[in-house]
């Protein structure tokens, strides 16, 4: 028996499901009475859902996990993960045994996206060419962690004096605050970019200080 | 060309353990069944137990169950098969063997490992 | 636990003749039969496995048959290096575990 799987990882957004696709060829007069079939985590090797001795044995992994019942005679031994985690991220293998057997391993990559960055100025008020501001950049509920860049109103990167700090939460998820300290000149624009490296989703937040009073573009 | 390399004959006394390696080389040893097989002497085959290394999954003949532990280091491409307990009737050599990547039967064998137990 | 009896438990032949070795299992096991040829000194050599088909390099004269509980193999013309002790062996479905008859002792007459 030839287990095969997609070579690229699956893809999956947080809270989303997911399909681990996994086939094999079944021999004519195959049954399902011959077919064991198990799921695991690839690394330590953690039953996720296994079919053995002619029927589906469930969920070993949070009750979460099903496979296609109907198309397993076909040979299709994917499995569908529910409700995707930050926590499910890694490699799962596909064990098929019949008279021989094979297995093959199958990457999950898990994402969420980040929302529109909020901006904030520190001091907000009484702002003079020279002064020295702080400008934060804050983008939420994003996986995996962002990639951040700032660049000024002609498009030049800022790279001096940037500091960034990502912090997971309780659902394994990033909020990423970014802070660019700035002299401010007559007037400019500051905008923050935060980036997605698996959606290659970019979310967008900018500020233009235009002498007195400062405004903020509009919500996009 | 799939090899299995057994560790040397051992003696043992009566109650203590013993604990036989085979390595396996030339090939993907996480993608083999290992199979422990013993013989007494002039006796016939026994089958013991065996792993399935990518699974971490050990299963066991009735007989030995409770007195024998088999374990694979995938880092090392070997198995082990160790027996507690031992008593005179253990004696025997005992033979590991695979039929090499996905395949069950069991077409590749060690040399064996004669274990002695007495007194 | 299925349970394999082969017979008989010696056969006499002499060289040239026909060899018929038969295994039979207390209950179904499917086609997952093996055979075995193991000589004094030697690790058991597989002959025949899920019931029927040759392992690599084992010669023609050898062949297997059967399904269900009853099993032969058959060696058709017996060379003087074939006489020797065969095993059958059975394999469970899931998890793989294996049984072995109690063996034939082949020897010339």
């Known amino acids: 028996v030839e287990v095969q799987v997609s070579e690229d990882p699956v893809v999956a957004l947080v809270d989303t499901d997911a399909t681990l696709r996994c086939s094999f060829s079944p021999e004519p007069g195959f049954s399902l009475a011959q077919l064991n079939l198990i799921w695991q985590l690839t690394d330590t090797k953690q039953l996720v859902h296994s079919f053995t001795e002619g029927r589906d044995q469930g969920s070993a992994y949070s009750n979460r996990t099903a496979l296609f019942p109907d198309l397993l005679v076909q040979g299709n031994a994917s499995l569908r993960l529910q409700r995707v985690r930050v926590t499910d991220e890694g490699s799962y293998t596909c064990f098929v045994s019949i008279q021989d057997f094979d297995s093959a391993a199958v990457s999950l990559q898990v994402a969420a996206p980040y929302s529109k960055p909020s901006m904030t100025l520190e001091p907000n008020k009484d702002l003079r060419p020279g002064n020295m501001v702080t400008i934060t950049c804050s983008s939420y509920q994003g996986y995996p962690e962002a990639e951040v860049f700032w660049k000024d109103g002609q498009g030049v990167p800022l790279t001096g004096n940037v500091t960034t700090s990502q912090m997971a939460n309780e659902r394994g998820l990033f909020d990423v605050h970014s802070v660019l300290r700035v002299v401010l000149g007559a007037n400019g624009t500051y905008s923050c970019l935060v980036r997605n490296p698996v959606l290659q989703q970019d979310a967008h937040g900018s500020v233009t200080i235009t002498g007195q009073p400062l405004t903020f573009p509009p919500e996009a | 060309q799939v090899q299995l390399q057994q560790s040397g004959a051992e003696v043992k006394k009566p109650g203590s353990s013993v604990k036989v390696s085979c390595k396996a080389s030339?090939?993907?040893?996480?993608?083999?069944?290992i199979s422990w097989v013993r013989q007494a002497p002039g006796q016939g085959l026994e089958w013991m137990g065996g792993i399935i290394p990518i699974l971490g999954i050990a299963n066991y003949a009735q007989k030995f169950q409770g007195r024998v532990t088999i374990t694979a280091d995938e880092s090392t491409s070997t198995a082990y098969m160790e027996l507690s307990s031992l008593r005179s009737e253990d004696t025997a050599v005992y033979y590991c063997?695979?039929?090499?990547?996905?395949?069950?039967?069991?077409?590749?064998w060690g040399q064996g490992t004669m274990v002695t137990v007495s007194s | 636990e299925i349970v394999l009896t082969q017979s008989p438990a010696t056969l006499s032949l002499s060289p040239g003749e026909r060899a018929t070795l038969s295994c039979r299992a207390s209950q179904s096991v499917s086609s997952y039969l093996a055979w075995y040829q193991q000589k004094p000194g030697q690790a058991p050599r597989l002959l025949i496995y899920d019931a029927s088909n040759r392992a690599t390099g084992i010669p023609a004269r050898f062949s297997g048959s059967g399904s269900g509980t009853d099993f032969t193999l058959t060696i058709s013309s017996l060379e003087p290096e074939d006489f020797a002790v065969y095993y059958c062996?059975?394999?469970?479905?899931?998890?793989?575990?294996?049984?072995f008859g109690q063996g034939t002792k082949l020897e010339i007459k």
């Open positions: 063997a695979t039929g090499g990547s996905g395949r069950y039967a069991l077409d590749i």
């Open positions: 030339g090939g993907t040893f996480s993608s083999y069944a």
């Open positions: 062996q059975q394999r469970s479905n899931w998890p793989p575990s294996y049984t």
